[in-house]
Interface confidence: medium
């Protein structure tokens, strides 16, 4: 005969655990239903009645099956210089990200408190290390035989074109200029770009009895340009 399916609430067999989407209520000493994402426990279960769930109120959410007494608050509204990449719904937190070309320079558990512009490497310097979610661009002088003629947070140093006859030799900030005959080898037109970093998205644990990967709001602060470092510009 097939085993009977127990309906919540029910007392688990000694040594066994509750099923998926159920939790063990210490007070009732019963396996009870969890609430679905977007809901919270309005009334906890008893020996004779199951959990009563209710929808999260506006500006609050739960992302996991849970039995929390109240939903989590969505993070702060995004500032004018942020992009809301995920809206606050009953099932997910708001996510604010730095605008393109910026990175998170000061963060806390709630997210990014300071969004700063990525350093731009000036002509004669190229990107040695691209910016990331939490680190600035690192510039380096273009080595002999390479150049960068742009002010950019993404362009690397590119090799000079190789000429049959050189009209003007290249330097760190200018490509070689060939005489009217075409060069033997040249780079494809246009600068070489490195990918832009994705703005910070900090992880924040939802206080439910199981771990959450709910991303918390990134808080961003539009700030003035970084002070010029060697080979960089704040413009």
């Amino acid at each position: 005969l097939p085993a009977q399916v127990a309906f919540t609430p029910y007392a688990p067999e000694p040594g066994s655990t509750c099923r998926l989407r159920e939790y063990y209520d210490q007070t009732a000493q019963m396996c009870c239903s969890k609430c679905s994402p977007g809901q919270h426990a309005k009334v906890f279960c008893t020996k004779t009645s199951d959990t009563v769930c209710d929808s999260c109120e506006d500006s609050t959410y739960t992302q996991l099956w849970n039995w929390v007494p109240e939903c989590l608050s969505c993070g702060s509204r995004c500032s004018s210089d942020q992009v809301e990449t995920q809206a606050c719904t009953r099932e997910q937190n708001r996510i604010c990200t730095c605008r393109p070309g910026w990175y998170c320079a000061l963060s806390k558990q709630e997210g990014c408190r300071l969004c700063a512009p990525l350093r731009k490497c000036r002509p004669g310097f190229g990107v040695a290390r691209p910016g990331t979610e939490t680190s600035d661009v690192v510039c380096k002088p273009c080595a002999p035989g390479t150049f960068s003629n742009t002010t950019s947070s993404t362009d690397i140093c590119r090799p000079h074109q190789i000429c049959n006859v050189v009209a003007i030799p290249g330097n760190a900030s200018m490509d070689a200029v060939c005489t009217s005959t075409s060069p033997t080898r040249s780079m494809a037109p246009g600068a070489v770009h490195l990918p832009q970093p994705v703005s910070t998205r900090s992880q924040h644990t939802q206080p439910t009895p199981e771990p959450s990967t709910a991303p918390s709001t990134s808080f961003l602060l539009p700030m003035g340009p970084s002070p010029p470092a060697e080979g960089s510009t704040g413009d």
């Epitope: 702060s76 000061l106 700063a116 206080p207 700030m223 003035g224």
Partner: antibody, heavy 120, light 111 residues
Framework: QVQLVQSGAEVKKPGASVKVSCKAS????????IDWVRQATGQGLEWMGE????????YYNEKFKGRVTMTRNKSISTAYMELSSLRSEDTAVYYC?????????????WGQGTLVTVSS | DIVMTQSPDSLAVSLGERATINCRAS??????????MHWYQQKPGQPPKLLIY???NLESGVPDRFSGSGSGTDFTLTISSLQAEDVAVYYC?????????FGQGTKVEIK
Amino acid sequence: QVQLVQSGAEVKKPGASVKVSCKASGYTFTDDYIDWVRQATGQGLEWMGEIYPGSGNTYYNEKFKGRVTMTRNKSISTAYMELSSLRSEDTAVYYCARSQVYGKIAMDHWGQGTLVTVSS
Amino acid sequence: DIVMTQSPDSLAVSLGERATINCRASESVDNSGNSFMHWYQQKPGQPPKLLIYRASNLESGVPDRFSGSGSGTDFTLTISSLQAEDVAVYYCQQSKEDPYTFGQGTKVEIK
């Protein structure tokens, strides 16, 4: 306008605990940090820690860890600071202050202060 | 912890004269071109009041005779023309990292 109103003065015996409340109004309580700062009579300001009411996350000054607990009640926009194992040197005015998540990153509005006296 | 040291401890200035308070941090309070240094004014029996945030930004409603400058570890609060209502204790504070720390305070009086 932003307002932080704190609970009244307290007199406690050494070893006891005190819980100070701070009711916020005039802004979205869950959006910004509430910091707690104390000032002994005639002394300077000392940061105790802060709470982010949206999530309940707390950041404590190591000096007070184990003795201080910061909580909040979102439904009544109130933050609390409880200090346990009180000693005479904890006699001070305790202030709550709002610190914006981004923008100033400074304490731009303060409560009126709560005097806590620890005396046997 | 970042230690904040103010100088002088007290300052007596004539009405209408300039008052200058210095604050030195034990390590830089800058991050990506921003200084996380703030100045507060506290009058007897009152909570502190924010005057200047992030080194040089005047808080709304604060008279423009107050100004802040500096970066890295050295910062200055200037009162360009001292008024009677400016008699108070002034504190610097850093919020670059926990624990946030204050200077010991500078008492400004009228000469």
